[in-house]
């Protein structure tokens, strides 16, 4: 039961969090910057990884992409790529997981499986949080390194006079959904593995010294069963028959010409 | 580069009219704000009048009610209608845009080589 809830939980957490990844990397409040004030209008300037927006005090609002403008900052696609990597590594592992969801059953799929799954998508939304998380980041750091405080020959503004300036950029909504949303899938990344551990069926197996039938090169080994953690239904205990087949740490049961006393 | 292109400057009799255009062209993201600064010799470059992307405007209180200023966001053009002229409103006339390239902090600040007007008595 508890081994359900966190997979659900976690599974919950890092769709959570990848909508929210999704959500930071539309976003176009990535950064931020006042361009002027005065009595008549205030211009408000933000930008986002595909475009650029000026927004007035009056209410009126214009965007434009990015398409074809050339001197982007180079960072600016890395930023991008490691948003876009971690969306796809994210639904990669939404889709994975839902199939790896104990309360779902799907033929005859065996715990192992649905444990192998768990943990491949439980990795996947660690990837995906890890990505989201350094895309916001490298963004974050570029304002702070590039744009935080420069001093620009701006025009101050409508009613104002022509003069150096200090403008600053400042981090924008999106920075922090990205991070939080990047927190909460590498959580419910971490979940998942978590839950991974309970879903596998621990597989034991007895050891005992070998008897050795005359004549036959037959190993029989009693209590060669396999044992299970509680969490499978492990019905398929099998005797293990091997050929002559002994433990690692077993010693030879009978005398050799090498045998040192 | 940005070029901005004035025209309509000008000798006129004081009351006359005259308009003042001018054209933005280049490599221009989204121009933010247009206008009209004046330099009369001896003295500092003044704003006249500005227009936002918006459509908002401001204009300076010697020239209200004389001067209307329009633009046309998608040819990037501002435009300066001057109406009853006094001699004081004589000086050179430029034009300014204010471009907001992504990433570039404060924007960009683009000025005409300006235009003369004069304004007889």
């Known amino acids: 039961m508890a081994v359900t809830a966190c997979q659900g939980l976690g599974f919950v957490v890092s769709l959570i969090g990848i909508a929210g990844i999704i959500a930071a990397t539309c976003m176009d409040q990535w950064s931020t910057q006042d361009l002027y004030n005065n009595p008549v209008t205030a211009v408000f300037n933000y930008q986002g990884l595909w475009r650029s927006c000026v927004r007035e005090s009056s209410g009126f609002t214009e965007c434009r992409g990015y398409f074809t403008l050339l001197g982007l900052p180079a960072m600016l696609q890395a930023v991008r790529a490691l948003m876009i990597v971690g969306i796809v590594l994210g639904a990669i592992g939404l889709l994975v997981s839902i199939f790896a969801l104990k309360c779902i059953r799907i033929g005859s799929m065996e715990d192992s499986a649905k444990a192998n799954m768990t943990l491949t998508s439980g990795i996947m939304f660690i990837v995906s949080g890890l990505c989201a998380i350094a895309g916001v980041s490298v963004f974050a750091n570029m304002l702070v390194t590039n744009f935080w405080m420069s001093t620009a020959n701006m025009y101050t503004g409508m009613g104002g006079m022509v003069q150096t300036v200090q403008t600053r950029y400042t981090f924008g909504a999106a920075l922090f959904v990205g991070w939080v949303a990047g927190g909460l899938t590498l959580i419910g990344g971490v979940m998942m593995c978590i839950a991974c551990r309970g879903l596998a069926p621990e597989e034991t197996n007895y050891k005992a010294v070998s008897y050795h039938a005359s004549g036959h090169s037959v190993a029989y080994k009693p209590g060669g069963f396999k044992a299970s953690t509680g969490f499978g239904s492990n019905t398929k205990n099998k005797k293990i028959y091997d050929g002559g087949a002994r433990t690692e740490d077993e010693v030879q049961s009978y005398p050799s010409k090498h045998d040192y006393v | 580069a940005v070029q901005l292109v004035e025209s309509g400057g000008g000798l006129v009799q004081a009351g006359g009219s005259l308009r003042l255009s001018c054209a933005a062209s280049?490599?221009?993201?989204?121009?933010?704000?247009m206008g009209w600064y004046r330099q009369a010799p001896g003295k500092q470059r003044e704003l006249v009048a500005d227009?936002?992307?918006?459509?908002?405007?401001y204009y300076a209180d010697s020239v209200k009610g004389r001067f209307t200023i329009s633009r046309d966001n998608d040819k990037n053009t501002v435009s300066l209608q001057m109406n009853s002229l006094k001699p004081e409103d004589t000086a050179a006339y430029y034009c300014?845009?204010?471009?907001?390239?992504?990433?570039?902090?404060?924007?960009?600040?683009?000025w005409g080589q300006g235009t003369q007007v004069t304004v007889s008595s």
């Open positions: 280049g490599s221009i993201f989204m121009i933010n704000a």
């Open positions: 300014h845009a204010h471009d907001v390239p992504p990433f570039v902090p404060g924007g960009k600040s683009y």
């Open positions: 227009i936002s992307r918006g459509g908002s405007t």
